[in-house]
Interface confidence: low
């Protein structure tokens, strides 16, 4: 089935924004929030922000989480505050990570 | 070391103008939104009204009170957020502070410049 | 629009822990944040994003946000910390940008 389309003037949520693509912003406004955990040069990397449009996310954030990727979205004002994503293995930790908080 | 130093200040009749300035160094003032916030003699502070940074569309936010008579405006190439004041009133009498907005918080605050409005 | 309530005052003896409360509906929706003030200075950040410390504020500062409640609360209190404090909540998409009405924290002795 295909996805709803949002509405001519979708509601913007306020998120948490942490990363690179933040600037100096600590929020951002859009369609939906995430909150991210890749794996960069060994390093765990924590990202959260948003999608401005609706398409951006869409793919995003139906993509499953892989051995080195997880996103997981949300709907609604700072939702991805207290979220954060996690790697699919549980309990195995991968070898020579470390938690590396992009701020 | 992130400094802001308000100016402009003074005193002015009711219905009168006056245009306060704000110079900012020690940081990237171009990245940064900017708030002007208020402080009635002997009370709290009031919120007045933001500017984004023109990365985040430039946009200007105002308080109820002062909206359609207040403008913020801000010069990147000068480091300078400014505030114009019009139609100005008796309840406008405060000590006017800068501040860095980092959208949660407001991260560093000038040391203010008292407006008094009075005839 | 949203109102924040402050008790006006509070006193604390040298040592011992103060907590100013800052209530209002839906504040868990939102982050807040803490200033300290000192007579004839402009206000400092002391605690952003409901629990966070800027750097440079002292660990005996903490805060927290849960039920309708922000709570600031100042673990052996000095008596440098007599200021007043202001709790702040925004909420752009909803048009709030909301100070509390301040508390005086006097520290006895």
């Known amino acids: 089935m295909e996805d709803e389309k949002p509405k001519v003037n979708p509601k913007l949520y306020m998120c948490v924004c942490e990363g690179l693509s933040c600037g100096n912003e600590d929020h951002c406004e859009g369609q939906q929030c995430f909150s991210s955990l890749s794996i960069n040069d060994g390093f765990h990397v924590y990202q959260k922000g948003c999608f401005q449009v609706y398409e951006q996310g869409k793919m995003t954030c139906k993509t499953p989480p892989s051995p080195g990727q997880a996103v997981e979205c949300c709907q609604g004002d700072w939702c991805n505050r207290n979220i954060t994503a996690q790697l699919p293995t549980k309990g195995k930790s991968f070898p020579g990570t470390q938690n590396f908080h992009l701020e | 070391e992130v400094q802001l130093v308000e100016s402009g200040g003074g005193l002015v009749k009711p219905g009168g103008s006056l245009r306060l300035s704000c110079a900012a160094s020690g940081f990237t003032f171009s990245s940064h939104a900017m708030s002007w916030v208020r402080q009635a003699p002997g009370k709290g502070l009031e919120w007045v009204g933001r500017?984004?940074?023109?990365?985040?569309?430039?946009?200007?936010d105002y308080a109820a009170p002062v909206k359609g008579r207040f403008t913020i405006s801000r010069d990147d190439s000068k480091n300078t957020l400014y505030l114009q004041m019009n139609s100005l009133k008796t309840e406008d009498t405060a000590v006017y502070y800068c501040?860095?907005?980092?959208?949660?918080?407001?991260?560093?605050w000038g040391q203010g410049t008292l407006v008094t409005v009075s005839s | 629009d949203i109102e924040l309530t402050q008790p006006p005052s509070v006193s604390v003896s040298p040592g011992q822990t103060a907590s100013i409360t800052c209530s209002g509906d839906s504040i868990p929706s939102f982050f807040a944040s803490w200033y300290q003030q000192k007579p004839g200075q402009a206000p400092v950040l002391v605690i952003y994003?409901?629990?966070n410390r800027p750097s440079g504020i002292p660990e005996r500062f903490s805060g927290s946000n849960s039920g309708n409640t922000a709570t600031l609360t100042i673990s052996g209190t000095q008596a440098e910390d007599e200021a007043d404090y202001y709790c702040y909540v925004t909420a752009p998409w909803k048009s709030i940008w909301v100070f509390g009405g301040g508390t005086k924290l006097t520290v006895l002795g």
């Open positions: 994003r409901d629990s």
């Open positions: 500017i984004k940074s023109k990365a985040d569309s430039g946009t200007t």
């Open positions: 501040a860095r907005d980092y959208g949660v918080a407001f991260a560093y």
